[in-house]
Interface confidence: medium
């Protein structure tokens, strides 16, 4: 939004469509501009002339700030923005009056307002800035810290958030956030923040507050881990009933609605939101939560956040799940898929979060529990999120899932197919200032399948013998992963996001190395764990020379800024379950794969379990759906008329520029997973 | 606060079609679920429709599924109902109205409305 009085007169300009939404934690450029008419004003032959004076401030609902003014090349900035806000641009462009803010907070949404006045001419544009994303703290409900780096992660993943960068937690700290519990970061460093420190909370900081470390972490160290949850379609339902639900009829109840539980992410972006319930609901990891916004004393003990509903009086265990509550129910289109009957007992994923109370019906909340250690065993709160003084019930009955015996099932043969299998990996373009790895071989080795395998199923056997010219990791495998649109298009956490919905994680640069050093090689820039972006060269070329010229070795982008773009590196383990492959005559769209594999107590694989059944010593040369409606498959045993001389999973593209999925529409087998 | 001002409204024939527009004022429409809701002469107010945010999810009531297209643009910070096939029983004054995103408590729970505009389908 621009403003000046009229043409010819000062104006200022911000060319940015409003509004501008950021993540929580990133940093934030303003671009400002103004064109100034009028020669150098002066007020007197004898005065010097008057330069443009700068003003910025934000505008929120609550008051109007001054961040900074600048003139005759002076900037002074508000001594509360001093380290935060700057004028890159000023006064080397005086006429650029553009705005840089560092690690945005919650608290810096608002209006911005840039004005500029010169003499008695005045103009001003405006820009609204949301803020986007929450951080909150995540708990495994059996006890605390028991989540390993990877299980840290898809903690998260299942509750529609991704685990928290160190700058959205210091964000979130400076908005509030306090808590003394040790939890996993994306960056694999375990930290908590403390505004006011005590014993047990001092961590490497003594009595300072301040996000707490404990530097980076063995992956395999247990503690919580904190999510980021950005945005969401959607919205959350509050669906109550005078008897309340159990578990199963909440389920139920928000089906019948159109909708599904909410996830513990969703949640906790409604309550930002403004959400406020002082009757607690079932959540779809069988929690039980209720958000309070507004504090009063006999509904969560007077404090703000998100509340949970333990078993134990220690803040373990969930509610029995034939108690009754009201169901909280998640309508939009961006559902996160989570099995029906994910969230088992004892099992690995049970996960649920923090503090607090059993409130049933509004509640005083008499007695306290003493306050926790960094490991220890609770948690204290300042505005928002949260504290706790739970009044708990006697234990239930323990809650199992009895899972469903398997069906027998037999196929067809193979027949045979002509599909694109990926040539040698030919990527397309995408400039960066610096060399991007673009790898180009000669035309697209387009190769018809021929029908020579005949094997019905094929499940990947555990110890099979070591892949050729795999690398060497512990049980697991690295892989190069892009979605099918386009190269380069995944942000830091889409590319968390992405190696996660393929049942992987994403690889750590130690990962990749040992790849690298078992003769992985891959031209395509790709995201690792430290937010590094990496690539492994063992053949030096023109496109592929990186850091390194013509050495051998993983090529390194340094730590990038989250928003940048590239393809990322994915590391999965051993494989729980089978992966087998399924064929018919007339094959099978996406969408009846998909079908088929549920009708059979299975489910679509997703790439990281091909891979990693691969790994194992799967070999087809079929291509076949994958959950992400990806067409692959996995070449043990190279030949020539199948996939090339190397061994790998091959991907079939649209175009020959390797990008673009198969039209789900079309027909191909199908790889199954259970 | 919002403040909500629809306009479009009048007689048509049925068959035909309208564009219903409701203009928000306040800076941070974008934030907000909108959605219009009708009430008929001697009945009830009743939900129509519904949108997202950022516009990727719609809702509708079923007696409209298929004939009207709820649409936002927050670059002007107006909400649009498109209605095709109008019938009588569509006959009613419109109401826009806003409430936050992220969650609500029932389909009529808006914390800001319009004064409405009348639709009259009539031959």
């Known amino acids: 939004e621009e403003t000046s009085d009229h043409d010819n007169s000062l104006s200022v300009s911000i060319p940015e469509p409003s509004p501008m939404r950021v993540l929580l934690g990133s940093s934030l450029t303003i671009p400002c501009y103004f064109i100034d008419p009028m020669h150098p004003v002066t007020t007197a032959p004898s005065t010097a002339p008057l330069a443009p004076r700068i003003k910025w401030s934000r505008i929120t609902k609550e008051k109007e700030v001054v961040l900074l003014v600048a003139t005759e090349g002076q900037v002074r900035i508000n001594s509360a923005y001093q380290d935060k806000v700057s004028l890159p641009n000023y006064p080397a462009i005086p006429s650029d009056a553009t705005l840089e803010i560092q690690n945005l907070r919650s608290n810096d949404s608002g209006i911005y307002r840039c004005e500029v006045m010169h003499g008695i001419e005045d103009s001003e544009a405006t820009l609204e800035v949301v803020v986007k994303g929450i951080v909150f703290h995540y708990r495994a409900i059996s006890t605390r810290y028991t989540l390993d780096f990877d299980r840290a992660q898809r903690a998260c993943l299942q509750n529609s958030a991704i685990i928290a960068t160190p700058e959205q937690l210091q964000a979130a700290y400076e908005d509030g956030f306090h808590q003394c519990d040790a939890g996993w970061l994306a960056d694999q460093t375990v930290r908590y923040p403390i505004h006011t420190p005590r014993e047990g909370c001092y961590g490497d900081k003594d009595e300072f507050p301040g996000v707490r470390t404990y530097g980076i972490r063995d992956t395999n160290e247990t503690y919580d881990v904190y999510c980021f949850a950005e945005e969401m379609e959607g919205e959350v339902l509050y669906a109550t009933s005078p008897e309340k639900f159990t578990f199963q009829e909440a389920a139920n109840e928000c089906r019948r609605l159109g909708a599904r539980l909410a996830t513990t992410g969703q949640l906790y972006l409604a309550w930002q939101g403004g959400m406020d319930m002082c009757s607690a609901g079932w959540l779809a990891d069988r929690s039980v939560r209720y958000p309070i916004s507004k504090a009063r004393p006999n509904c969560g003990g007077n404090l703000l956040g998100v509340r949970t509903v333990y078993l134990h009086a220690n803040q373990t265990g969930y509610p029995d799940p034939s108690s009754r509550y009201d169901a909280i129910c998640y309508t939009g289109e961006d559902f996160v898929d989570i099995p029906e009957n994910f969230f088992g007992v004892g099992g690995e994923e049970d996960i649920t979060i923090q503090t607090v109370t059993w409130p049933d019906v509004e509640l005083p909340l008499p007695r306290n529990i003493t306050e926790g250690e960094a490991r220890g065993n609770v948690i204290l709160t300042v505005k928002p999120i949260f504290d706790l003084s739970p009044t708990a019930p006697e234990p239930e009955e323990p809650f199992t899932f009895v899972p469903e015996p398997e069906k027998p099932f037999t196929f067809a043969t193979d027949v045979g197919v002509t599909a694109f299998p990926e040539a040698e990996n030919r990527t397309g373009e995408a400039t960066r200032p610096w060399g991007v790895p673009e790898e180009s071989t000669p035309g697209p080795a387009f190769t018809a399948f021929t029908s020579e395998d005949h094997v019905v199923q094929v499940t990947a056997v555990p110890g099979a013998a070591e892949v050729p010219g795999q690398p060497r990791l512990p049980g697991g495998v690295v892989f190069h992963y892009r979605p099918g649109s386009a190269r380069y298009s995944l942000t830091f956490e889409e590319a968390q996001q992405a190696c996660l919905r393929t049942g992987a994680v994403i690889a750590s640069p130690e990962q990749l190395q040992a790849a690298y050093e078992a003769g992985y090689e891959q031209c395509d820039a790709g995201w690792l764990q430290d937010q590094t972006v990496r690539y492994p060269i063992v053949s030096p070329r023109t496109p592929c020379v990186g850091d390194k010229d013509s050495s051998p070795g993983v090529r390194t982008y340094g730590v990038r800024p989250p928003s940048e773009t590239y393809d990322v590196y994915c590391y999965v383990d051993k494989l729980e379950g089978e992966v087998f492959f399924i064929t018919r005559l007339e094959q099978f769209t996406f969408q009846e794969a998909l079908a088929f594999c549920e009708s059979h107590n299975a489910t679509l694989a997703s790439t990281g379990q091909l891979y990693a059944a691969w790994r194992q010593g799967l070999d087809k040369c079929y291509a076949g759906w994958l959950s992400d409606g990806s067409l692959r498959y996995p070449i043990v045993t190279p030949r020539p008329s199948c996939g090339g001389d190397k061994p790998g999973v091959r991907t079939v593209y649209l175009y020959p520029n390797q990008t673009g999925l198969p039209d789900p529409l079309s027909r191909h087998h199908v790889f199954c997973f259970r | 606060d919002v403040q909500l001002v629809e306009s479009g409204g009048g007689l048509v024939q049925p068959g035909g079609s309208l564009r219903l527009s409701c203009a928000a004022s306040?800076?941070?429409?974008?934030?907000?679920?909108m959605g219009w809701f009708r009430q008929a002469p001697g009945k009830e107010r009743e939900f129509v429709a519904a949108?997202?945010?950022?516009?990727?999810?719609?809702y509708y009531a079923d007696s409209v599924k298929g004939r009207f297209t709820i649409s936002r643009d927050n670059s002007k910070n107006t909400v649009y109902l498109q209605m095709n096939s109008l019938r009588p029983e569509d006959t009613a004054v419109y109401y826009c109205?806003?409430?936050?995103?992220?969650?609500?408590?029932?389909?009529?729970?808006?914390?800001?409305w319009g004064q409405g505009t009348l639709v009259t389908v009539s031959s």
């Open positions: 109205a806003a409430r936050p995103r992220y969650y609500y408590y029932s389909l009529y729970s808006y914390d800001y």
């Open positions: 306040g800076r941070t429409f974008s934030t907000y679920t």
């Open positions: 949108i997202s945010w950022s516009g990727g999810t719609t």
